[in-house]
Amino acid sequence: EPPTACREKQYLINSQCCSLCQPGQKLVSDCTEFTETECLPCGESEFLDTWNRETHCHQHKYCDPNLGLRVQQKGTSETDTICTCEEGWHCTSEACESCVLHRSCSPGFGVKQIATGVSDTICEPCPVGFFSNVSSAFEKCHPWTSCETKDLVVQQAGTNKTDVVCGPQDRLRA
């Protein structure tokens, strides 16, 4: 009685259970009454990352420098190449097929999380008591200057974009 299901790492063909090819190898010939499955290693710049019955290996991903990409991890016969972005850029998707320049946080906003090769800058509005007067991909919101610690008084209130302006205390004369 021919099998209707096969063990793990096998596949059913022509009423026979054949061994799948191991990662890094492609299928040449299905097993037969006389022979085991025939597999061949993937070529240079090719890979297969699972037990498989593929007749063609997949091409390694190309990290195109024209798109701001560079190789983070070189592919093997069993793994794909992993791309990342050049310094100052980040991936537009999880697959990292292209890069965009890191976003800068506008005045009134500070950097909450600095960008990486795979994630953009995260900005946050400067809360009361903090400001940012530059457009930057690195600068956090800075605290307003404390006039009191300098024995000065606030002459102009700060905003989310400007620091306070301190000045000398008015001395009342008798």
């Epitope: 010939s29 006389f34 085991e36």
Partner: antibody
């Protein structure tokens, strides 16, 4: 449908080289393996060697030194070449696909001067 | 090189009676994957060998169920439950586990 057909010289002189071609149809030689068997008159079959789908070859220990099996996938042909023939090489030569029971009709080769 | 030894060399059988042929291998025919590539062929007079049984016990398509194969490791048997006239010929065991592939010397079945 699957077919294999051998074409050989029929008569070969001792010490000469034998060339037989197996032309196949109904399948691709890049996906299937083919082996060669010979059977001398009144004797049992002898496995000679094979050409795997991936292009590698295996040979009988006793024939290895004078046997070459090759293929031309685009022409759907597997070739057998055997040198230094003697009368003991007189046999019917078959090419066979390595699955099911697909045999060529066989070609009789007689080695005689 | 692996040897396959068949017995008996000649097997006279009465029509309708059972027949049994033995094939012994000089080393185990179990492959690393667990398959055992031991096969049985029948060669009728004037014909090429025809596959009866593959991988010890699997009947090839179109082969009558009076033919059965069994065994493991190095000892294998072909059985015919009731011999018919068309079963006359030479039976060969063959292995494709180890390169070079080999054939047994043959068993000639004839009707008594």
């Amino acid at each position: 449908q699957v077919q294999l057909q051998e074409s050989g010289p029929g008569l070969v002189k001792p010490s000469e080289t034998l060339s037989i071609t197996c032309t196949v149809s109904g399948f691709s030689l890049s996906r299937y393996s083919v082996y060669w068997i010979r059977q001398p008159p009144g004797k049992g079959p002898e496995w000679m060697g094979m050409m795997w789908g991936g292009g590698s070859t295996d040979y009988s220990t006793s024939l290895k030194s004078r046997l070459t099996i090759s293929k031309d996938t685009s022409k759907s042909q597997v070739s057998l070449k055997m040198s230094s023939l003697t009368a003991a090489d007189t046999a019917v030569y078959y090419c066979v696909r390595t699955d099911g029971d697909y045999w060529g009709q066989g070609t009789l080769v007689t080695v005689s001067s | 090189e692996l040897q396959l030894t068949q017995s008996p060399l000649s097997l006279p059988v009465t029509l309708g009676q059972p027949a049994s042929i033995s094939c012994r291998s000089s080393q185990s025919l179990a492959s690393s994957s667990g398959n055992t590539y031991l096969h049985w062929y029948l060669q009728r007079p004037g014909q090429s060998p025809r596959l009866l049984i593959y991988k010890v016990s699997n009947r090839f398509s179109g082969v009558p169920d009076r033919f059965s194969g069994s065994g493991s490791g190095t000892d294998f048997t072909l059985k015919i439950s009731r011999v018919e006239a068309e079963d006359v010929g030479v039976y060969y065991c063959s292995q494709s586990t180890h390169v070079p592939w080999t054939f047994g010397g043959g068993t000639k079945l004839e009707i008594k």
